[in-house]
């Protein structure tokens, strides 16, 4: 099964995907596609990187993080209900069957007119971490788990990276204090 990520119509959606480059600047090709990861490729590609740069992207899809450090998380701008569905992040590590592939489910909810949800409720969903395990085919694809051990430095960093998300706005506007421990 895949982990579910949520956004509201009109917001930016964030789908996390990371890898650790063997050395700084030693990048591997990555592709993002709409639809579950097929056996070799990425489905209907919306964004692709090569060993140097983003070499293909479509409107509204971009990488907000530092992809040169392995943060290839996808941001989808101004989402609509039609953006709901499964997305594939495929890290095309050279070698024999080294690909890492992740299926992420994006659920788009109609825009709320009620107050924003509390920080407590959205915390885990907004700060996921990759559990990177390898699979050799779609049936063995592993996906993502929730974050068990965030610290304040990570919160600060992630909040900056997710500045368009509701949680980042909550952190900024509410002055919330988060206790770890």
């Amino acid at each position: 099964s895949e982990v579910e990520y949520r956004a509201e119509v009109g917001q930016n959606a964030y789908l996390p995907c990371f890898y650790t480059p063997a050395a700084p600047g030693n990048l591997v090709p990555v592709c993002w596609g709409k639809g579950a990861c097929p056996v070799f490729e990425c489905g209907n590609v919306v964004l692709r990187t090569d060993e140097r740069d983003v070499n293909y992207w479509t409107s509204r899809y971009w990488l907000n993080g530092d992809f040169r450090k392995g943060d290839v998380s996808l941001t989808i701008e101004n989402v609509t209900l039609a953006d709901s569905g499964i997305y594939c992040c495929r890290i095309q590590i050279p070698g024999i069957m080294n690909d890492e592939k992740f299926n992420l489910k994006l659920v788009i909810k109609p825009a709320k007119v009620t107050p924003a949800p509390t920080l407590q409720r959205d915390f885990t969903a907004a700060f996921p971490r990759m559990l990177t395990t390898r699979g050799h085919g779609p049936a063995e694809t592993q996906t993502l788990g929730s974050l068990p051990d965030i610290n304040l430095t990570q919160i600060s960093t992630l909040a900056n990276e997710l500045r368009d998300s509701r949680l980042a706005n909550d952190l900024r506007d509410s002055g919330a204090t988060i206790r770890i421990g």
């Epitope: 591997v28 090709p29 990555v30 592709c31 596609g33 639809g35 579950a36 097929p38 056996v39 070799f40 490729e41 990425c42 489905g43 209907n44 590609v45 499964i86 495929r90 095309q92 590590i93 050279p94 070698g95 024999i96 069957m97 080294n98 690909d99 299926n103 050799h136 085919g137 779609p138 049936a139 063995e140």
Partner: antibody
Framework: EVQLVESGGGLVQPGGSLRLSCAAS????????MSWVRQAPGKGLEWVAA???????YFPDSVKGRFTISRDNAKNSCYLQMNSLRAEDTAVYYC?????????????WGQGTLVTVSS | DIVMTQSPATLSVSPGERATLSCRAS??????????MQWYQQKPGQAPRLLIY???NVESGVPARFSGSGSGTDFTLTISSLQSEDFAVYYC?????????FGGGTKVEIK
């Protein structure tokens, strides 16, 4: 028009090596996974190697460690290097294009090149 | 590995008749609601030709008399009214897992 043209087949002794080439034209080669599929005389089809658009490699156990696949996007070409050849590797070898966005099935095939492993 | 078993090995049919070919996978090839199963046609001395992908989608340029159905482990290729050019060998193939595997083929011959 999409075209795939294989070359490099021939007669080789057991234990020998051979390098097959597949020249592609009529499509944006770098966007597609490419595979090699073989067919022994009078037998069925067997997939033997694939390389994704990003350069990841895939093989069945029957050829792993003996065969390798590579691609040169600048030359629109795909290659199958076959080492430690055995009599059971005798077959027509087809180069096949994986369907865009998937790669796991084949919408265009070359006409094949015959590899005969015999002493 | 996923083993693909086709039946019958040979099918004798008269022109104009309906042909039904079967393929069974050793495990499910369903993936997020799609059956990762293909059918190919091969004539003597020629390369295979893709007919059906994802169990039931007819490849562009393939006559409408060809259709595919099935899900899970059991799949069928149907040729509604056999034409002379349809006598060939037909292979199923799964794209669920590496290694990609083909069935042993069904030869459709003239009765």
């Amino acid at each position: 028009e999409v075209q795939l043209v294989e070359s490099g087949g021939g007669l080789v002794q057991p234990g020998g090596s051979l390098r097959l080439s597949c020249a592609a034209s009529g499509f944006t080669f770098s966007r597609y996974a490419m595979s090699w599929v073989r067919q022994a005389p009078g037998k069925g089809l067997e997939w033997v190697a694939a390389i994704s658009s990003g350069g990841s490699l895939y093989f069945p156990d029957s050829v792993k460690g003996r065969f390798t696949i590579s691609r040169d996007n600048a030359k629109n070409s795909c290659y199958l290097q076959m080492n430690s050849l055995r009599a059971e590797d005798t077959a027509v070898y087809y180069c096949a294009r994986g369907r865009e966005a998937d790669g796991g099935y084949f919408d265009y095939w070359g006409q094949g090149t015959l590899v005969t492993v015999s002493s | 590995d996923i083993v693909m078993t086709q039946s019958p090995a040979t099918l004798s049919v008269s022109p104009g008749e309906r042909a039904t070919l079967s393929c069974r996978a050793s495990e499910s090839v369903e993936y997020y609601g799609t059956s990762l199963m293909q059918w190919y046609q091969q004539k003597p001395g020629q390369a295979p030709r893709l007919l059906i992908y994802a169990a039931s989608n007819v490849e562009s340029g393939v006559p409408a008399r060809f259709s595919g159905s099935g899900s899970g482990t059991d799949f069928t290729l149907t040729i509604s009214s056999l034409q002379s050019e349809d006598f060939a060998v037909y292979y199923c193939q799964q794209s669920m897992k590496v290694p990609l595997t083909f069935g042993g083929g069904t030869k459709v011959e003239i009765k």
